[in-house]
Interface confidence: medium
Amino acid sequence: LPAQVAFTPYAPEPGSTCRLREYYDQTAQMCCSKCSPGQHAKVFCTKTSDTVCDSCEDSTYTQLWNWVPECLSCGSRCSSDQVETQACTREQNRICTCRPGWYCALSKQEGCRLCAPLRKCRPGFGVARPGTETSDVVCKPCAPGTFSNTTSSTDICRPHQICNVVAIPGNASMDAVCTSTSPTRSMAPGAVHLPQPVSTRSQHTQPTPEPSTAPSTSFLLPMGPSPPAEGSTGD
């Protein structure tokens, strides 16, 4: 690495280019200094004077080394279904991500433009593919021998309990009912939950454990109506 830094502006020789934090000014025909993140070019360079930089004003930013005449405006405030995971500063734009229980239906370069609540599978349907940061839950009908009696965005279809003597046969939305003798089950009792997608940037949201007999990694949050779809709850 060089022990010193050459002063700008200077004329680049043929075969050479301006260095990393410099730009070629077409008017001056010189390599000139870029402005650091959080600043913008107040006065452009000339053959004898370098770029004059100034700090970005409130609610504006520049994230990169630049020579823009004005800083960029920070995005609008996050909506109620979003969490601000990065505040607007002079060096970075505001980033809004979807809160737990929601997914990003329309993304932008950083963060999310439009969040939508995760689909809930109605009784008789279980989660085939869990929701992610950017995709909705996919529901599927419970296959013979399995059921789901909940309206949930995390529950999968569970196997019917196996009775020595069946009182009421199970169906897609109800477990089998046994006579008083002890039933056996192919899986552990209690609802089976899939983990709910949590935005990687949602560090400020404290998860609330869902009341359940079995441990769960899902979150219980007030949810609005889901868009109607096969196997999901309608309005």
């Epitope: 050459a6 200077y10 004329a11 680049p12 020789e13 043929p14 075969g15 050479s16 280019t17 260095r19």
Partner: antibody
Framework: QVQLLESGGGLVQPGGSLRLSCAAS????????MTWVRQAPGKGLEWVSG????????FYADSVKGRFTISRDNSKNTLYLQMNSLRAEDTAVYYC????????????WGQGTLVTVSS | QSVLTQPPSVSGAPGQRVTISCTGS?????????VHWYQQLPGTAPKLLIY???NRPSGVPDRFSGFKSGTSASLAITGLQAEDEADYYC???????????FGGGTKLTVL
Amino acid sequence: QVQLLESGGGLVQPGGSLRLSCAASGFSFTSYAMTWVRQAPGKGLEWVSGISGGGAATFYADSVKGRFTISRDNSKNTLYLQMNSLRAEDTAVYYCARQSQYVGGFDYWGQGTLVTVSS
Amino acid sequence: QSVLTQPPSVSGAPGQRVTISCTGSSSNIGAGYGVHWYQQLPGTAPKLLIYGNTNRPSGVPDRFSGFKSGTSASLAITGLQAEDEADYYCQSYDSSLSGWVFGGGTKLTVL
């Protein structure tokens, strides 16, 4: 490490031709402009010719324009100088050098090859 | 006659400071093109000492420093040592010649 190795020098009669080569290694050859610089016995350095990394742009000193041709074969990492219509005043040690990507200057030099033009 | 003008020789005693000047014109140094300095020890190829007016490549001692003002530049060597005895050349690009130009060279003698 960066290495530049010139070859092709020797004794040639006035009006004759010679082709110098410079084998480059230890760096991305296509990314750098290359140049030839000469030094007559007991004299100073004189820039002769230069070529851009891709080979599209070439530059010549007035003293060799029309007689010398610089070229490069990027597949072989080799720089060339074709010298025609040689004169006694072309007698010199010819150095090949790499041009620095940023700011300029010739940051690596070969050991040189001697060209003697004499009858 | 070189496009860039240097004194033919300079000398100094060990430990002293010497400067070598390089005078150009409005088409080279004065146009804003970088000035580069080379050291050539006897019987060897030139070595880049200073590039872009003031920059030292890694491995070059901080005893060597470059300066530029207007159409002139200079190389300063402090704490002169016997091994500094060599020829020194300045170089720049000249827009009117569309080529690189060297100074005539300066022979440094360490007394």
